[in-house]
Interface confidence: low
């Protein structure tokens, strides 16, 4: 078989003999050097991902209940290309499992034992499955038979296709659970026309369920959406109050050596050719012998997945809760203190030691996890293995946008009502040497440049969104001679002043001697012309505060600032020349983990901040030489964000809007990622 | 909902006995963890015993170890705390406390009203 041949897996007759066709017509329209078509048929869809594992066959397409499968060990395949549904202009690639309710019910998420449930069909993913595996734990025991631990936790229900001898309760509310349209509750419009028939006070659902059975707005308005953190929002917003966002149809391929570029120039010019309207001979998206035969009747294209994504992004955190749950039937059995301990996210070696040292000093409140880079650790966050972390405003922006919420913030300024008032921000400045008489913001270009790291607030986000606005390009690696914004690509020129060695150099971590504020600043001291960092970093390195080797000798009057209106002015002028305002840098979490992770953070800040005098001989949470390990040196204390508490909320308009323009210049994976998601 | 309710507190001297018992009402299946919190005055609400519904885990604070034991009866929905050997610093308001399964969803700890505690010397 030639190197570029996909091997397509079909999983009955009708299958096969439309992948033959689908073969034939591809070689027919596209160059011999192109993609090509090979057909392997297998008896079952968990053939196919055996298959695929072990390299027999390359793809095949998906729903997410078997996306799930294909991620688990030992088949480890991803998600490479999406089946979209709706118009070009607005692809839906997923949609929304939700719990509606009737809006003078009164009750929330936390409250639904004893009440009557409709479901579209036993086994299906938003009327069952997603819902059951939520409320899993919840589930008297014992939990199996699980249709038992349900018929006992709802007071009544209707479950289509449930056993009504066994399970009577299922049955309730349709006797008999016939599992057709015959029964009139039966699917999506059947379990919401329970619902509103009064026979059942929650429906499980899809997003659309209510907007496709009512077509009137003063109707819908009747209707709810249950949120998971126990509050209601109305059913238009179902993208923030869901119980799992689920993909549609996804084609999967192998992790590693998986063709995933390959797969998607055969789908994209399949598309092109044979999408809808496109051929009368042959239709990707048709079936005449069958429903949904390789791909999707109802699909309209494909959209590439970014490669970023693994299968437990792509299907989040509360899908692949609730499938664990059911698949796995076990529940975690709570410590009996209030709060499970929180993971710290640590990256690389020097904030893992730091880590280490406040999980001893926490007893078991704190626990680690690492990673190399910012962007791992909210991967991890997103999918379960971390639950918190510090974060630059450029960061909680990507953060927001990956479903995490802001949950303190840090404060740097000492106030006796520091923990109450969240504070309004620090100045994001650009230092140069006093001795560079000549350089002003207007003359710039060519010089060589100093950033606490890509994506980061003060380093690259405000100088390099404010540069845009006058270059118009994204080519800052060709605007500045050189420099070192840590986390840009290995070959840039923004690479060449890093001083890491090996594969260290350039790396957006600690191992980078250039990363971050003390990083950017020696970057400055040692080989650059300007530094972007933040108002606090010059004094903070200066006048003896830095002990370090390259900074102990320096003097704060040997640097100045450059304002944005072409003057200079000294390093404590910063209120009057600066960049731009810059949020402070708060943790993050995910919202299920919200009220734990505020609770045990500021016990752990009572224990361990400000307030301990001694850092030589005791645990300081807010101290590491200048390293800014974790948190910020200079944090006085995690403060409460009061209603801010949604990364737009926290970030302000002003800054999204800014980090928005720039994301045309954006590197970053994992918010392509997640803007995929959701976007 | 779960419904927690105290009774058996009361005055005592030093080096007594009292056993607590704590009423579970409703929702009772959705519990994973029960057991007894005290506050005394001026002071932070700390655990003093707790153990999980199944019985594999038992935690007691190290200032009653030995002292206080927690059992309960499943049938009656009930925990005890027994408090044997007691000393004026265990002079508190106990609370009753049950902890929901934990499952995706966010909780919040059930609590009773509380009863006092008075050890005289």
């Known amino acids: 078989v030639p190197d570029k041949t996909v091997r397509w897996c079909a999983v009955s007759e009708h299958e096969a003999t439309k992948c033959q066709s689908f073969r034939d017509h591809m070689k027919s329209v596209i160059p011999s050097d192109g993609p090509s078509v090979a057909c392997v048929k297998k008896a079952s869809y968990l053939d196919c991902i055996r298959a695929i594992a072990a390299n027999e066959a390359d793809a095949v397409t998906l729903d997410a209940g078997l996306v799930y499968d294909a991620y688990l060990a030992p088949n480890n395949l991803k998600p490479v290309v999406a089946e979209f549904y709706g118009s070009k202009e607005d692809p839906q690639t997923f949609y929304y499992a939700v719990a509606v309710v009737k809006k003078d019910s009164g009750f929330q998420m936390n409250q639904l034992r004893g009440k009557k449930s409709c479901h579209t069909g036993l086994g299906r993913s938003a009327g069952w499955n997603i819902p059951i595996g939520l409320l899993y734990c919840d589930l008297p025991e014992p939990r199996k038979p699980l249709e038992k631990a349900v018929a006992n936790f709802f007071s009544g229900s209707c479950a289509p296709c449930a056993d009504g001898t066994d399970f009577p309760q299922l049955c309730q509310l349709c006797p008999g659970c016939g599992c057709s349209t015959l029964n009139q509750y039966f699917g999506y419009s059947g379990a919401f026309k329970c619902l509103k028939d009064g026979a059942g006070d929650v429906a499980f659902v899809k997003h659309s369920t209510i907007f496709e059975n009512l077509a009137n707005k003063a109707d819908r308005d009747q209707y709810e959406l249950l949120c998971l953190d126990n509050t209601r929002k109305p059913v238009d917003e179902y993208k923030d109050c869901h119980l799992a966002q689920v993909p549609s149809h996804t084609v999967v391929a192998r992790s590693m050596g998986g063709k995933e570029d390959l797969i998607w120039e055969l789908l994209n010019q399949a598309q092109e050719h044979f999408g809808k309207d496109k051929s009368k001979e042959f239709q990707l998206f048709s079936s005449p012998h069958g429903k949904d035969l390789l791909f999707k009747d109802s699909a309209h294209g494909f959209l590439k997945v970014p490669p970023r994504m693994d299968a437990k992004m792509y299907l989040g955190y509360e899908y692949v809760t609730a499938i664990r749950n059911l698949r796995e039937g076990t529940c975690p059995e709570a410590p009996t203190d209030e709060c499970k301990p929180v993971k710290w996210c640590a990256l690389s070696h020097h904030e893992r030691l730091k880590c280490d040292e406040w999980s001893v000093n926490s007893v078991g409140k704190i626990e680690c996890v690492s990673a190399e880079t910012t962007e791992d650790c909210i991967a991890k966050i997103m999918n379960g293995e971390a639950d918190a972390m510090s974060l630059d405003g450029g960061f909680v922006y990507i953060a927001g946008k990956c479903g995490l919420v802001p949950v303190l913030a840090e404060n740097y300024n000492k106030s006796d009502n520091c923990e109450d008032t969240p504070e309004a921000g620090y100045f994001a400045i650009a230092v140069v040497k006093k001795s560079a008489s000549d350089l002003t913001w207007d003359n710039l270009k060519g010089k060589k440049s100093c950033h606490t790291a890509v994506g980061r607030t003060a380093g690259w986000n405000i100088p390099m969104g404010l540069l845009y606005n006058k270059i118009n390009h994204c080519r800052f690696d060709e605007f500045f001679s050189e420099g070192c914004a840590p986390g840009s690509k290995k070959d840039s020129s923004l690479c060449k002043l890093c001083m890491g060695s090996g594969l260290n150099l350039c790396e957006p971590n600690n191992k980078e001697g250039y990363y971050g504020y003390t990083g950017a600043f020696r970057c400055l001291v040692e080989k650059g012309d300007v530094a972007f960092v933040k108002h606090q970093t010059v004094p903070q390195n200066t006048g003896g505060k830095n002990p370090d080797p390259w900074a102990k000798n320096l003097n704060e009057k040997d640097y100045e600032l450059l304002c944005l209106d072409g003057t200079r002015k000294p390093v404590e002028e910063y209120a009057n020349c600066h960049l731009a305002r810059a949020p402070n840098h708060a943790v993050v979490t995910r919202k299920d983990k919200e009220a734990c992770v505020h609770k045990i953070l500021r016990q752990q800040q009572h224990l361990f901040g400000s307030n301990v005098t001694d850092c030589s001989g005791n645990f300081c949470l807010f101290r590491s030489e200048t390293k800014d390990l974790l948190f910020r040196d200079d944090t006085v204390c995690l403060a409460k964000l009061h209603d801010r508490n949604t990364y737009e909320k926290y970030l302000g308009e002003e800054y999204v809007k800014a980090v928005g323009n720039l994301r045309k210049c954006s590197t970053s994976s994992l918010l392509e990622a997640c803007t995929f998601r959701r976007p | 909902q779960v419904k927690l309710e105290e009774s058996g507190g009361g005055l005592v001297q030093a080096g007594g006995s009292l056993r607590l018992s704590c009423v579970a009402s409703?929702?009772?299946?959705?519990?994973?963890?029960v057991g007894w919190y005290r506050q005394a005055p001026g002071k932070q609400r700390e655990l003093v015993a707790a153990t999980t519904t199944s019985g594999s885990s038992t935690n007691y604070a190290d200032s009653v170890k030995g002292r206080f034991t927690i059992s309960r009866d499943i049938a009656k929905n009930t925990v005890y705390l027994q408090m044997d050997s007691l000393k004026p610093e265990d002079t508190a308001v106990y609370y009753c406390y049950a902890r929901p399964k934990q499952a995706t969803l966010i909780r919040d700890d059930y609590w009773g009203q509380g009863t006092q505690v008075t050890v005289s010397s």
């Open positions: 409703g929702n009772v299946f959705g519990i994973d963890a």
